[in-house]
């Protein structure tokens, strides 16, 4: 972690709880106001490696709903709509932070958790040709 | 939010702070132990819509380092290595949760923040607008 001098206006924390447990304000600040959320909404259908989105719901997690991408094909889609066996559709994965209720069912106590989610798919060449 | 009956073993929270402020344990639990983090690390180079990864660092945020994808080309890369301008490389974006120190520089007080990150790129057919 990065050592940051405490500001005198900071909430108190006992040493035994710091930095293990912190206070988090759940009033989400959204930095994406200028971004149209629909921008990438149709890429899943128009991609040469199209994907479907599956809803993953867990009330013990925040956010409780996460959308997981599953590539529709193993290969990529050619201009004529048929499969290209020489290319592969693969999921692009990202580790994200979520809050897990801990102890379970507690409304105001969480643990930070890292989960791997598939965000979409991309089309890759299966073989990397190494040039001598 | 989902109303969940409080477990008697839960930490106390005063009504005025709930559900706005919660306690979060920062000892991250990683659910991805079975996943090899190197698996998709070379897709950015082998994709028909390759991307570069840019480091975005902010000590007032947790995690402080986030990697942002920027598509290398406007078009997509063909098998011969040339760019196909009839297709478009586009970023796949995802909203993720981060913790923002609030007040600034406070080590144990955060606000939840949603930010939009580009995770990778995919190759899509452009939308053709037909003029009547």
């Amino acid at each position: 972690g990065i050592a940051i001098p405490r500001n005198s206006g900071c909430p108190n924390s006992e040493d035994k709880n710091f930095p293990r447990t912190v206070m988090v304000n759940l009033n989400i600040h959204n930095r994406n106001t200028s971004t149209n959320p629909k921008r990438s909404s149709d890429y899943y259908n128009r991609s040469t490696s199209p994907w479907n989105l599956h809803r993953n719901e867990d009330p013990e997690r925040y956010p409780s709903v996460i959308w997981e991408a599953k590539c529709r094909h193993l290969g990529c889609v050619k201009a004529d709509g048929n499969v290209d066996y020489h290319m592969n559709s693969v999921p692009i994965q990202q580790e994200i932070l979520v809050l897990r209720r801990e102890p379970r069912h507690c409304p105001n106590s969480f643990r930070l958790e890292k989960i791997l989610v598939s965000v979409g798919c991309t089309c890759v060449t299966p073989i990397v040709h190494h040039v001598a | 939010g989902i109303a969940i009956p409080r477990n008697s073993g839960c930490p106390n929270s005063e009504d005025k702070n709930f559900p706005r402020t919660v306690m979060v344990n920062l000892n991250i639990h990683n659910r991805n132990t079975s996943t090899n983090p190197k698996r998709s690390s070379d897709y950015y180079n082998r994709s028909t819509s390759p991307w570069n990864l840019h480091r975005n660092e902010d000590p007032e945020r947790y995690p402080s380092v986030i990697w942002e994808a920027k598509c290398r080309h406007l078009g997509c890369v063909k098998a011969d290595g040339n760019v196909d301008y009839h297709m478009n490389s586009v970023p796949i974006q995802q909203e993720i949760l981060v913790l923002r120190r609030e007040p600034r520089h406070c080590p144990n007080s955060f606000r939840l923040e949603k930010i939009l990150v580009s995770v990778g790129c995919t190759c899509v057919t452009p939308i053709v607008h037909h003029v009547a």
Epitope: H73, L74, N82, P126 | -
Partner: antibody
């Protein structure tokens, strides 16, 4: 019940031709990728051809490229393999196999095979 | 082409034994691996796809694991009806290629 029945095998001289058929039943043939896989006597398995659900994509390994042609007639629920310029090394049991998806990557149902012998 | 090296080529084990077969690809195949069982005079039967996903109706004593280039097929408790030759197949890069097979016999 899914069934794949191959026919058309037999003895043929080197340089000759043969056309194999695979009659499919028990599933909607037009929505599945299909393949031909062969097995030389006492040997392992080798991919011969792949065709996607509508016939719009095909693939052949170098060992048969230019000599073999895979096709399908979805109205007749039948898969074909046209084999020309046959060689002794093409001697094998030829299986038709179904992919559980549209395209032909791995195979959840196989026929019982038809033996092709190339010999003078 | 991607080479699939399967080992051992044959093995003999007792009923109830744990049997392990390995398959090594010449390069990363990103879990795109299937395992088949072929009994003498019969067509192959799909057991596992995606390296670990057991096909419907396949007994749970069969399992698959691995990633990257190295994959393993396990029979947790060998049964008399498991006598067969087992093949792995990669479907990451065309042409799809098979391992040389492992013949499993009962001691």
């Amino acid at each position: 019940e899914v069934q794949l029945v191959e026919s058309g095998g037999g003895l043929v001289q080197p340089g000759g031709s043969l056309r194999l058929s695979c009659a499919a039943s028990g599933f909607t043939f037009s929505t599945y990728g299909m393949s031909w896989v062969r097995q030389a006597p006492g040997k392992g398995l080798e991919l011969v051809a792949i065709i996607n659900h509508n016939g719009g994509s095909t693939f052949y390994p170098d060992s048969v490229k230019g000599r073999f042609t895979v096709s399908r007639d979805n109205s007749k629920n039948t898969l074909y393999l046209q084999m020309n310029s046959l060689r002794a090394e093409d001697t094998a049991v030829y299986y038709c196999a179904r992919d559980p998806r549209h395209d032909g990557y791995f195979f959840d149902y196989w026929g019982q095979g038809t033996l092709v012998t190339v010999s003078s | 082409d991607i080479q699939m090296t399967q080992s051992p080529s044959s093995l003999s084990a007792s009923v109830g034994d744990r049997v392990t077969i390995t398959c090594q690809a010449s390069e990363d195949i990103y879990d795109r691996l299937a395992w088949y069982q072929q009994k003498p005079g019969k067509a192959p039967k799909l057991l596992i796809s995606g390296a670990t996903s057991l096909e419907t109706g396949v007994p749970s004593r069969f399992s698959g694991s691995g990633s990257g280039k190295d994959y393993t097929f396990t029979i947790s408790s060998l049964q008399p009806e498991d006598i067969a030759t087992y093949y792995c197949q990669q479907y990451w890069s065309v042409p799809w290629t098979f391992g040389g097979g492992t013949k499993v016999e009962i001691k």
